[in-house]
Interface confidence: low
């Protein structure tokens, strides 16, 4: 996170840190006590599938607390869409081996109807994204969790007011524009499969998974969020489906 | 809609404004009121606007110059009360009012929903934690706002 | 018209179920409303018992929490009471009754059935 | 649990008097509250929703007033058929409760 702040601890209940072989990989988002969203592209170049390990409740990895989580990854799911490399359709839900227990630093968000998500929530403006990702474009990685409050734009916005770049990936319906353009504040590399959390009346809800950019804060550029809205009906059908054999599940979008 | 009027001074009137054209002035010799005599003028010198009972729905109806306005039953709204307010009431309407998730329903009005581990409170609208640690809240915020001391 | 009919046993004895069903007609159970169930143990006052909403979630008085389940069967245009583990002070006229549950009207309950009277005793 | 408390208990008033039942709220309820009348051996029938919103087909003579805590039900001039058991109601959080009614009876 470039330009955040500390997210007090507990504050962020919902974080996942996703490590591979003990080694910092992506974000995630716990769901419910079983289930954590993350990012597809996070997955792209793992080989020992087994040694992925999802923690809940951390705060400040230099140190252990007593509030943390750590329960083996049974299965990542990613829709036959995405393809590795690119950009459209980043999305893995992941299967925890076993649930999680909840407690005051480790809690769901909410995964919104979609209907609430499209009409309600994505015309809530400011929203939080967070993780341990880097603190500067090439810089180093956050010991404590970060947190930043981004504004969302309308597709149409974030292109006339981006800076065209040859090879940009295209901005589809499956993604949504967030951020600042000016350089100061963004997520970055190590936040991708983080939440964007948006908040109404209340509650805290997932809107959005931290996915990819131009470089980080750079100037005349957004950062750019899994649109999980196209996602709901994808997720809860897995979720309610008998578990399949394999760690790895390319399921059917839509 | 001003019948009223007529029967305050109906010998007069009948002489004055009805079988000849009188002024502004004559009809407050009449009326010895300014009040009633606006109404009255109102509706005189440019016709009554309530006379095609334009206001719906029981509404009431007010002359006005060249124009008339409606006071609505508390259930309707708009310029000639058409509108019912529940209609108004749907989901795409700040979210038909619910604090989570709203239905329309064809014939019917919208309805409110919540998320598991909440159930909706009995204003139909907000939803309450029915689970201690209900998705979407930060407990240790929700504890420390619970314990701050109330003003008074 | 909306009416509402309660029908069930009139005597049940203590430690047993008390079972009741509210037949609903001139209204379909799925539409909309909150459906429920309200008591009225003799020469005293009203007590609600809980109710179901349309879409199938259920809430009860804390009081009675543990021992109340109250079900609906569309089919049938139906929903139903039971109390478990009733004693004598379970003995009351129980009335199904029902609020339409809209923005602006909180639990009014417009509609009720006539009542029917419970008596636990062995 | 939000208790009602109504009073009083019991009004003993001649057809034609007003009639004024009072309901106080143990915490504020806004104007979540509604009144019912009661005759005996029948379902209780809404009177009033809202604390002040007449309910269909029930005649002018009963209004209701209030907010927060203290809410009154008015019955303009009494007729005969008035005298019956008034209950108010909690509407607006879990559990709804029942004030333990007010019984109107002809003096």
């Known amino acids: 996170i470039v330009g955040g702040k500390v997210c007090p601890k507990g504050e962020c209940p919902w974080q996942v840190l996703l490590l591979v072989n003990g080694a910092q990989l992506c974000g995630g988002t716990l769901i419910n006590t079983i289930w954590v969203v993350s990012a597809a592209h996070c997955f792209d170049k793992i080989k020992n599938w087994r040694n992925l390990i999802a923690v809940l409740g951390e705060h400040d990895l230099s140190e252990h607390d007593g509030d943390e989580q750590s329960r083996r990854v049974a299965q990542v799911i990613i829709p036959s869409t995405y393809v590795p490399g690119t950009t459209n359709h980043d999305i893995a839900l992941l299967r925890l081996h076993q649930p999680v227990v909840l407690t005051d630093h480790v809690v769901p968000l909410c995964l919104p109807e979609r209907t609430f998500s499209e009409r309600t929530l994505a015309f809530v403006r400011f929203s939080l994204v967070s993780g341990w990702g880097q603190l500067l474009d090439r810089g180093a990685t956050a010991l404590e969790l970060m947190v930043l409050n981004v504004p969302r734009l309308m597709t149409q916005d974030c292109l006339q007011q981006s800076r065209k770049v040859g090879d940009s990936p295209n901005i589809t319906e499956y993604m949504f524009c967030a951020g600042y353009s000016d350089g100061s504040k963004d997520s970055c590399k190590g936040d991708s499969g983080g939440p964007h959390a948006t908040h109404y009346r209340g509650t805290w809800y997932l809107t959005g998974i931290v996915s990819w950019g131009q470089g980080c804060a750079t100037v005349g550029h957004f950062g750019v969020y899994t649109r999980v809205s196209q996602y709901i009906e994808w997720l809860q059908k897995l979720m309610r489906s008998e578990p399949r054999p394999g760690v790895l599940l390319r399921a059917p979008f839509p | 809609a001003n019948a009223f009027l007529e029967e305050l001074r109906p010998g007069s009137l009948e002489r004055e404004c009805k079988e000849e054209q009188c002024s502004f002035e004559e009809a407050r010799e009449i009326f010895k009121d300014a009040e009633r005599t606006k109404l009255f003028w109102i509706s005189y010198s440019d016709g009554d606007q309530c006379a095609s009972s334009p206001c719906q729905n029981g509404g009431s109806c007010k002359d006005q110059l060249q124009s008339y306005i409606c006071f609505c039953l508390p259930a309707f709204e708009g310029r000639n009360c058409e509108t019912h307010k529940d209609d108004q009431l749907i989901c795409v309407n700040e979210n038909g009012g619910c604090e989570q998730y709203c239905s329309d329903h064809t014939g019917t009005k919208r309805s409110c929903r919540c998320h598991e581990g909440y159930s909706l409170l009995a204003d139909g609208v907000s939803c309450t934690p029915t689970v201690e640690y209900p998705c979407g809240k930060i407990p240790i915020l929700e504890k420390r706002n619970a314990s701050k001391p109330q003003g008074r | 018209q909306v009416q509402l009919q309660e029908s069930g046993p009139g005597l049940v004895k203590p430690s047993q179920t008390l079972s009741l069903t509210c037949t609903v007609s001139?209204?379909?159970?799925?539409?909309?409303?909150?459906w429920s169930w309200i008591r009225q143990p003799p020469g005293k006052g009203l007590e609600w018992i809980g109710y179901?909403?349309?879409?199938?979630?259920?809430n009860y008085n804390p009081s009675l929490k543990s021992r109340v389940t109250i079900s609906v069967d569309t089919s049938k245009n139906q929903f139903s009471l039971k109390l478990s583990s009733v004693t004598a002070a379970d003995t009351a006229v129980y009335y199904c009754?029902?609020?339409?549950?809209?923005?602006?009207?909180?639990?009014?309950?417009?509609?009720w059935g006539q009542g029917t009277s419970v008596t636990v005793s062995s | 649990e939000i208790v009602l408390t109504q009073s009083p208990a019991t009004l003993s008033l001649s057809p034609g008097e007003r009639a004024t039942l009072s309901c106080r709220a143990s915490?504020?309820?806004?104007?979540?509250l509604h009144w019912y009348q009661q005759k005996p051996g029948e379902a209780p029938r809404l009177l009033i929703k809202?604390?002040?919103q007449p309910a269909t087909g029930i005649p002018a003579r009963f209004s209701g007033s209030g907010s927060g805590t203290d809410f009154t039900l008015t019955i303009s001039s009494l007729e005969p058929e008035d005298f019956a058991v008034y209950y108010c109601?909690?509407?607006?959080?879990?559990?709804?409760?029942f004030g333990q009614g007010t019984k109107l009876e002809i003096k």
């Open positions: 109601q909690n509407g607006h959080s879990f559990p709804l409760t």
């Open positions: 809202y604390t002040s």
């Open positions: 009754a029902r609020s339409v549950n809209y923005y602006g009207n909180s639990f009014a309950v417009g509609y």
């Open positions: 915490q504020g309820i806004s104007d979540y």
């Open positions: 179901i909403y349309y879409s199938g979630s259920t």
């Open positions: 001139g209204y379909s159970i799925s539409s909309d409303s909150a």
